[in-house]
């Protein structure tokens, strides 16, 4: 077709609009071009979601979303002659898809996954209120690296929860975290029904603990040195360094964003090892200190799960009690 | 050995607050949902509230509901019941409960007494 | 909501003799049934759960059964330490609900 038409000529409604699921939660709506369309219409289609939101104008008879099933979604489709938000498309055509079958109080709840140490995930889950203490469930998962849904083997139990780790490692492609991992927990018996969840690669990392390499005094500093968990870089993480010293019985926690090792007390050119001074500390008193990191939004989405803490390590010495 | 205590029952006047704790120790606390169930004197046991183990799933009984406020602090394994509004009728023993398995209550506490009077 | 009714409300039985206690639910609650027995001025302690299987701890005397909608509490050879409130519940589906309690006498 060539240039739009008049505003005021409202194009026919697409047709065959029809909806499937991919993987596990990817929804993909096709349809046809109207007929009957006018011939100096260079078609694009609007498009939103049921609650009017991501609105899209594109010249694609498509649509995809990323979404876990856990209720309906209905995408609404209409076709116009522009990219123009404010031309009138036609009639709009809704498809919809609804979630499994089953008792909404039989499905899992609190269904959530955490990336440990970008090498493997690990995602537990509470039963279902209306479900039989023998339930048997499986988890699946896909993301973009498999070519096909795969099933989690590891189930195991702690407490009240149910959980499953699978290995996922960090592909060195630039864009493997801008992905997500697609999850479904359903049962063996096919009794209850499936819940689904979507976790983002860049939320919800847990790294390993750090390892403390060193400890020195110099004059009333003390001077910490550690190894970052394998997989990350030191400007990704931010860091806690408790300090306990016996004598005083002080706990000093301090919160660290940047850990350079520029001064020359500490040992230059180690790879993936951060450093930090504390300031005041007594060295003819035995002082413990102990290190946790975090993602930070630098890199990732989320900064709220700190790893478990390093192993102690401490310097000084303790004073005999007279 | 498992165990929860709870603490902080009393006398309070009708339409008067009070927060209930409950103390547990014994077990990983952030993998147990708690639950406080009531009984009014002379009276069977009523449910009141669950807070699931990391808190994300809260429920109350209709008849708390709007009133009655569950939490949970992980970092000290307590469980709390602020208790809002409150009437006559919730004049009763408050009980902790740890859940198990597929929701019995495996472990309860001595229970405190909420007298609510003016 | 589960109902669930208990019966009888009260018993007064001798020692050594064998009691039934059965609890009836509104619908169908599979094995989602559990027995509570509480002493007087004591906290509630758990029995039998999911029906039928026995509590770590408790004696063997007592046994339950049942699914669906109808549970029994089996006390055999009463002893007089199970002088006691004896509460059902539910926790198929939310609220909880207990059945409103049989109480067994010892003569």
């Known amino acids: 077709g060539g240039g739009g038409a008049a505003p005021t000529e409202t194009q026919p409604p697409v047709t065959n609009l029809s909806v499937s699921v991919e993987n596990l939660c990817t929804v993909i709506w096709t349809w046809n071009p109207p007929e009957g369309a006018s011939s100096n219409c260079s078609l694009w289609y609007f498009s939103h979601f049921g609650d009017k939101q991501d609105k899209k104008i594109a010249p694609e008879t498509r649509r995809s979303i990323e979404v876990p099933l856990n209720e309906r979604i209905c995408l609404q489709v209409g076709s116009q002659c522009s990219t123009n938000e404010s031309e009138k498309p036609s009639i709009l055509v809704e498809k919809c898809i609804s979630p499994p079958e089953g008792d909404p109080e039989s499905a899992v709840t609190e269904l959530q996954c955490i990336w440990h140490n970008l090498s493997y995930m690990k995602c537990s889950w509470l039963p279902g209120r209306n479900t039989s203490p023998d339930t048997n469930y499986t988890l699946y998962y896909w993301h973009r690296s498999l070519e096909k849904i795969h099933q989690c083997e590891n189930i195991f139990r702690e407490g009240q929860y149910f959980g499953c780790s699978f290995d996922l490692t960090k592909v060195k492609d630039s864009s493997f975290e801008q992905h997500s991992v697609q999850i479904m927990v359903k049962d063996n018996a096919g009794k209850i029904k499936p819940s689904f969840n979507i976790v983002p690669l860049t939320s919800r990392v847990k790294p390993d603990p750090p390892h403390i390499k060193n400890l020195s005094f110099h004059n009333d500093d003390l001077y910490v040195q550690w190894e970052n968990p394998q997989n990350f870089i030191s400007r990704c993480l931010f860091y806690e360094v408790e300090v306990n010293n016996s004598q005083t019985e002080t706990h000093n926690v301090f919160y660290v964003q940047e850990a350079k090792c520029e001064n020359p007390e500490f040992e230059r050119n180690v790879e993936n090892t951060s450093c930090f001074m504390v300031p005041g500390v007594l060295p003819d008193t035995l002082n413990t200190v102990r290190i946790r990191v975090k993602t930070n939004k630098l890199c990732y989405e989320d900064d709220k799960l700190w790893s478990n803490w390093s192993q102690e390590m401490s310097i000084g010495k303790k004073r005999n009690s007279t | 050995e498992v165990q929860v205590l709870e603490s902080g029952g009393g006398l309070v006047q009708p339409g008067g607050s009070l927060r209930l704790s409950c103390a547990a120790s014994g077990f990983t606390f952030s993998n147990y949902a708690m639950t406080w169930v009531r009984q009014a004197p002379g009276k069977g046991l009523e449910w009141v509230s669950t807070?699931?183990?990391?808190?994300?799933?809260?429920y109350y009984a209709d008849s708390v509901k709007g009133r009655f406020t569950i939490s949970r602090d992980n970092s000290k394994n307590t469980v709390y019941l602020q208790m809002n509004s409150l009437r006559a009728e919730d004049t009763a023993v408050y009980y902790c409960?740890?859940?198990?398995?597929?929701?019995?209550?495996?472990?309860w506490g001595r229970g405190t007494l909420v007298t609510v009077s003016s | 909501e589960i109902v669930l009714t208990q019966s009888p409300d009260f018993q007064s039985v001798t020692p050594k003799e064998k009691v039934t206690i059965t609890c009836r639910a509104s619908?169908?609650?599979?094995?989602?049934l559990h027995w509570y027995q509480q002493k007087p001025d004591q906290s509630p302690k758990l029995l039998i759960k999911y029906a039928s299987q026995s509590f770590s701890g408790v004696p063997s005397r007592f046994s339950g059964s049942g699914s669906g909608t109808d549970f029994t509490l089996t006390i055999n050879s009463l002893e007089a330490e199970d002088a006691a409130a004896y509460y059902c519940?539910?926790?198929?589906?939310?609220?909880?609900?207990f059945g409103q309690g049989t109480k067994l006498e010892i003569k």
């Open positions: 409960a740890k859940e198990e398995g597929h929701w019995y209550f495996d472990v």
């Open positions: 519940m539910s926790s198929w589906g939310l609220p909880y609900t």
């Open positions: 619908q169908s609650i599979g094995s989602s």
């Open positions: 807070i699931s183990g990391r808190g994300y799933s809260i």
